[in-house]
Amino acid sequence: QPPPPPPDATCHQVRSFFQRLQPGLKWVPETPVPGSDLQVCLPKGPTCCSRKMEEKYQLTARLNMEQLLQSASMELKFLIIQNAAVFQEAFEIVVRHAKNYTNAMFKNNYPSLTPQAFEFVGEFFTDVSLYILGSDINVDDMVNELFDSLFPVIYTQLMNPGLPDSALDINECLRGARRDLKVFGNFPKLIMTQVSKSLQVTRIFLQALNLGIEVINTTDHLKFSKDCGRMLTRMWYCSYCQGLMMVKPCGGYCNVVMQGCMAGVVEIDKYWREYILSLEELVNGMYRIYDMENVLLGLFSTIHDSIQYVQKNAGKLTTTIGKLCAHSQQRQYRSAYYPEDLFIDKKVLKVAHVEHEETLSSRRRELIQKLKSFISFYSALPGYICSHSPVAENDTLCWNGQELVERYSQKAARNGMKNQFNLHELKMKGPEPVVSQIIDKLKHINQLLRTMSMPKGRVLDKNLDEEGFESGDCGDDEDECIGGSGDGMIKVKNQLRFLAELAYDLDVDDAPGNSQQATPKDNEISTFHNLGNVHSPLK
């Protein structure tokens, strides 16, 4: 062992450095002292440190560590926070557009329905937004409420416009008849399937991003243990006690210390990796009926088709409803709700410019690629922090926690530290409670992401229609079907690309839903199906 260089006889350098940490010099000895009261920087000879200095060094070391950790995660944190905000806003834009498309469809095709239809459409899309943001709303209930509310208006305004006012108290009966008679055919069920699948995925995607932020925030603000503070002090500051102001810690030693300090945090690594890979799988499956943009922007068309379906069966429906609702007191249904003041969103919607005309799906894929570059973030943290704090290159002529050494040996360092502090003990303590909690949250979201990840290949249940549509109305590619009908089916591709160029107003004449509206090629109700023993299409 080379003899340590003679300490500063006056502790002058130590005093000037320490003054930067703590104004005032009352704690710094003027000349080296025995230091028998020291607990961390155990001296091999006279020392320029006191117990109070040691405590201050420990506090500073822990603060340094927290700052290093925060700067290590800054880029990742910003990436997730920014994307969570961008996607949340983008989803809101899609919902607003979907609402305006649907309102425009009513305005252009069914003007007599508009005041009430606008209200019901508005309520439906408000619920959609709330659901995406995590509200405890059932998607099937939302869709049922939309159609339950629409049917009485369709029946009284479109199918029987001459109905006397005295007959308008049949709203309750009509709401019930809507489900009993399946007046919209299979369309509500189609919408339920598409909307619930796409919104579930959207919601879990946002939840996952928000949890990502929470994970980073949690590890960002970790309070390091006293044991860790002692190790950091020994690594960063104990050399000062010997007057070795310019000596840097050995790289290998830094890694050992950081692994000890970060043992709990590093336990997140496994779940963090799984989180990013599960999120990637979810994103890869977000297309067709699992893509809310695709589904919501096509809703106006499906709703239009469903109304045409009702109109096509107007005669038969009127016969049955005349029978069921003539004595409506005989039948009990939930009460309908029609507020007095009808809210009509006439606002011109201009879409926020999306850079490079990118679509939501390309933006999602881009995010995943960036996140994947952070897949080893937690396992790499100890090394990252060491590389971003002063360490000696090649482990030569460096500080090993006790003395200046020519070459760092992990074994020697461990032996030397045995009595002072046990690294193994630190690792065995397990993660902080907050880290355990965040690991549990990651496990939970990973499980959700796994269950939500789409099966490859066909994604739509083949047996959507227990009533036996004669053939899949959307051809072989049912999972791409938005319009729910054979010809003129609208498939919305690269939505945000055209949204970016769209200044949309309810008064636009060529609004979606104005032309080439598709109708179901086979009418379930008014068609007998030669399918043998299948669920009755005539019921």
Partner: antibody, heavy 118, light 113 residues
């Protein structure tokens, strides 16, 4: 008032064919479905088949292959049941019935008695 | 085909008594999308056409006295006549209109003692 008026009793020889009619009043047959039901003497009810007069789509019980044909004439608001290759097994009362959308048979004709014998 | 089994095949009761008859289906008649059972009950008096009493297993047809009650769900259904009257002498049929071919039960003959 909704009514279904069926044609009178028929007495025919085996091997021949017969056409029974059912004329609706009080509603348009296009606004419902018309079905036919068979009831042999002292027996239960058997569904034969039905028609959607709006588009002439039909559905039959597989037990009556080629035996029964249901047609509708919307201009006269009448539905018909054509029975061919008659045998004594076809001796029965034949009812027409209206079926509103989503419901069972709510109005029935008075029935037509068909007797097949030589 | 869906088979409907009615029981008993006949029963004799005195005027004023309550009567119950059953109809069992070989398949469920409940439509999950609207929670309706596609089962009807008809009454056929001697020499007359059948008349609809109950649809959707439990909804009384307009004009049918409230002493007739339908109940049950899935595969097991019941028609109850409370305080039987002499005019209730008839054969009662259940029918499924859940899927083609539509089928009827064999009937329960109600006789008055």
């Amino acid at each position: 008032e909704v009514q279904l008026q069926q044609s009178g009793a028929e007495h025919v020889k085996p091997g021949t064919s017969v056409r029974l009619s059912c004329t609706a009043s009080g509603f348009n047959i296009k606004d419902a479905y018309i079905h036919w039901v068979k009831q042999r003497p002292e027996q239960g009810l058997e569904w034969i088949g039905g028609i959607d007069p709006e588009n002439d789509n039909t559905e039959y019980d597989p037990k009556f292959p080629g035996k029964a044909t249901v047609v509708a004439d919307t201009s006269s608001n009448t539905a018909y049941l054509q029975l061919s290759s008659l045998t004594s097994e076809d001796t029965a009362v034949y009812y027409c019935a209206r079926r509103p959308l989503g419901l069972p048979f709510d109005y029935w004709g008075q029935g037509t008695t068909l007797t097949v014998s030589s | 085909d869906i088979v409907l089994s009615q029981s008993p095949s006949s029963l004799a009761v005195s005027v004023g008594e309550n009567v119950t008859m059953n109809c069992k289906s070989s398949q469920r008649l409940l439509d999950s999308s609207n929670q309706r059972n596609y089962l009807a009950w008809y009454q056929q008096k001697p020499g007359q056409s059948p008349q609809l009493l109950i649809f959707w297993a439990s909804t009384r047809e307009s004009g049918v006295p409230d002493r007739f009650t339908g109940s049950g769900s899935g595969t097991d259904f019941t028609l109850t006549i409370r305080s039987v009257k002499a005019e209730d002498l008839a054969v009662y049929y259940c029918q499924q209109y859940y899927s083609y071919p539509f089928t009827f039960g064999s009937g329960t003959k109600l006789e008055i003692k």
